[in-house]
Interface confidence: low
């Protein structure tokens, strides 16, 4: 579905009956068993109490069964993402049953009405599952509901209403408006399945959040902080409305959750890993790259089942397109002294040199400020696998890039006209790979030269001792 925006409203207990004045097709829910990867193929329609289609269409009672649940729809037809997901599931799980839940007539309405219909659609899915459970060999534990946008909450209702517990629900950017802060029985929640994993790709802390911001699963993964997705164009979505690009930007970021999931199905040799962290800012600082005590996990289909006492928020960076995997590094830089720093923060870049490849020049994002006589932690990530790291080039950018910084420099100069030059002293850089969990220490090439100043660079090589502390468990891929 495109985006869960439409007029609006809060989720209501009482289901609104579709208005008699609407001339659309009578509201219904249909279950289409996809018997082919071909989107044009008709598939088989399943209905409660009718066993013949199960036999005619070779429904495999002992195999995994996926239910794909779309969300609110503007066009009234299935969109491309759904065909891609069906195809990816067929490719990955050849014997599985892939069922598309078609609730288009109920979803192709004003958003408020579509939301009010989610409950009845959830009931329909639960009834189908209850009926299937009456068959020999069918196990609810083999059922995986995959819901996108409003469909994620439909999956929640289905999991809530079914007799027993479904194996897994994956929420792909569950809808935000009317669900944010809602009671657990009125939205997707960890109670709805044995394992509930969620990808959040379009959350906003300002204005309206199309995707739900709050954690709603056992694990909630926020790629790129859960907001601005690389490759989705304009950052200021609201500012772009006037230029007609809101559709593309919103669709790109909201739908990114689906493509990340598809990526996890078709590129299982390039799994993306997410790391548990209390918030996005801490993750950006590079603090959260641990895999100890289940603190990291594969994202998407390959996620390992984790049933935490409370929601686990996890973060990762991604590329702009498939395969989305990047390689995360924590960089700990101990600044043991600095001179004449003035008001402005330095702008640092690093280049990592490895046995397989060298990185591009990567900015070190200063989330707060550089601390003196303290270890400053940064997150950097590369799109390519560098292999084992050999050396690091640290560069302090010379000329200021912003008028604000230029102004601060000028003010600094006025107050200290004989500023003898800004300088920082760094002896070593500690690096930890998120993907391998290996830790290394890099020392300055020349132990006598540890200072760096604007426009200059410092080179670091692996120290002799290597600082290979206790290896933590690496995020091995456990295929479901």
């Amino acid at each position: 579905s495109p985006v869960p925006f439409g007029p609006e409203g809060r989720l209501e207990d009482k289901l609104h009956k579709p208005k008699a004045t609407q001339t659309e097709v009578k509201p219904s829910v249909r279950f289409n068993l996809r018997t082919s990867k071909d989107p044009e193929h008709e598939g088989c329609y399943l209905s409660v109490g009718h066993s013949q289609p199960l036999e005619d269409c070779s429904f495999n009672m002992t195999a995994k069964t996926f239910f794909i649940i779309h969300g609110w729809t503007m066009s009234g037809i299935f969109e491309n993402w759904l065909h891609k997901l069906v195809s990816a599931l067929h490719t990955r799980e050849k014997d599985a049953n892939v069922v598309v839940v078609d609730w288009l007539p109920l979803a192709h309405q004003l958003y408020t009405d579509a939301v009010n219909n989610t409950r009845v659609v959830g009931h329909s899915i639960a009834r189908m599952l209850d009926w299937l459970q009456e068959k020999d060999d069918f196990s609810l534990g083999n059922v995986h509901l995959i819901g996108y946008s409003l469909g994620a909450h439909v999956a929640g209702y289905a999991g809530n209403f079914v007799k027993g517990t479904v194996g897994r629900i994956t929420g792909l950017d569950p809808a935000g408006p009317m669900f944010e802060g809602a009671d657990i029985h009125k939205r997707l929640s960890p109670d709805d399945a044995d394992f509930v994993d969620v990808l959040h790709t379009y959350t906003r802390s300002f204005g309206l959040s199309i995707g739900i911001q709050m954690p709603v699963g056992h694990i909630d993964i926020y790629p790129n902080g859960g907001d601005f997705q690389p490759g989705c164009g304009l950052n200021d979505v609201l500012g772009s409305i006037a230029y007609g690009t809101i559709t593309e930007v919103v669709k790109c970021e909201h739908e990114r959750a689906v493509h990340l999931f598809v990526d996890s199905l078709v590129n299982q040799d390039k799994p993306s890993f997410a790391f548990q962290c209390t918030d996005s800012n801490r993750f950006k600082k590079g603090i959260c790259l641990s895999c100890r005590k289940n603190r990291c996990n594969s994202i998407g289909y390959n996620a390992k089942k984790m049933r935490n006492k409370r929601n686990s928020k996890m973060y990762l960076k991604t590329r702009a397109g498939m395969p989305f995997r990047v390689y995360h590094y924590q960089m700990k830089i101990h600044v043991f002294s600095y001179k004449n720093m003035g008001e402005i923060e330095p702008t640092f870049y690093v280049t990592l040199y490895g046995t397989n490849a060298d990185s591009q020049t990567l900015p070190l994002e200063i989330v707060e400020r550089i601390e003196q006589n303290a270890t400053n932690t940064f997150l950097v990530y590369t799109e390519e696998d560098l292999g084992d790291l050999l050396k690091i080039q640290l560069t302090w950018e010379g000329a200021s890039q912003s008028w604000y910084n230029l102004w601060k420099e000028f003010r600094s100069y006025l107050s200290q006209p004989r500023n003898p030059g800004r300088e920082l002293n760094i002896r070593r850089i500690r690096v930890k790979s998120g993907e391998t969990q290996r830790k290394l220490t890099f020392c300055t090439e020349d132990p006598e030269n540890t200072s760096i100043s604007p426009g200059r660079e410092l080179w670091f090589r692996k120290c002799r001792d290597g600082w290979r502390m206790k290896n933590e468990t690496s995020p091995t891929v456990e295929l479901p």
Epitope: M74, S75, G76
Partner: antibody, heavy 119, light 106 residues
Amino acid sequence: QVQLVQSGAEVKKPGASVKVSCKASGYTFTEYTMHWVRQAPGQGLEWMGSINPYYGGTSYNEKFKDRVTMTRDTSTSTVYMELSSLRSEDTAVYYCARYGNYVGYFDYWGQGTTVTVSS
Amino acid sequence: EIVLTQSPGTLSLSPGERATLSCRASSSVHYMYWYQQKPGQAPRLLIYYTSNLAPGIPDRFSGSGSGTDFTLTISRLEPEDFAVYYCQQFTSSPYTFGGGTKVEIK
């Protein structure tokens, strides 16, 4: 640039019908619902109904449902609103308004078409 | 249908003054939308989802409220702000508008 251009003013006799057009440009016509809102002289705004250009699904205000018909022509990116059995109280300015489905409000409006019903 | 009642019907103020416009719904609505209309022109969206400023609208406009009571505030009236303001609900069909509040120069 998004534009909604409506047909010109109409003068009709009571009991007759009027068909107002609204031609859309500057965006993908089938991706946004079009609504019709009218405003009688010196009065407020009144929602009449909507049409989804993708497959022609309509939703009408109960007050008008026996007299209003909304259609669309995707080849020309135009929506039409026909009101039958006209009476003097139907004298108003009729606006088409694009409903921004990705943001949930009337984000662009036509310039309005004045329909006068007089014997 | 949900009836929206706007008050006052007319507000006479001078440029630079603060304007507070009220919209009351006959039953609870989820969000409120506000439009500005000048003579001979189509309405223009100001506020959506109760408190979100539409693109290109100056921040002297703000919206608030919940349930049945909603408010549009113009912190300092500019000459171009003198117009008629309508509230609207999308909670329940038919999607109704308020009767309007005319903000005129004192």
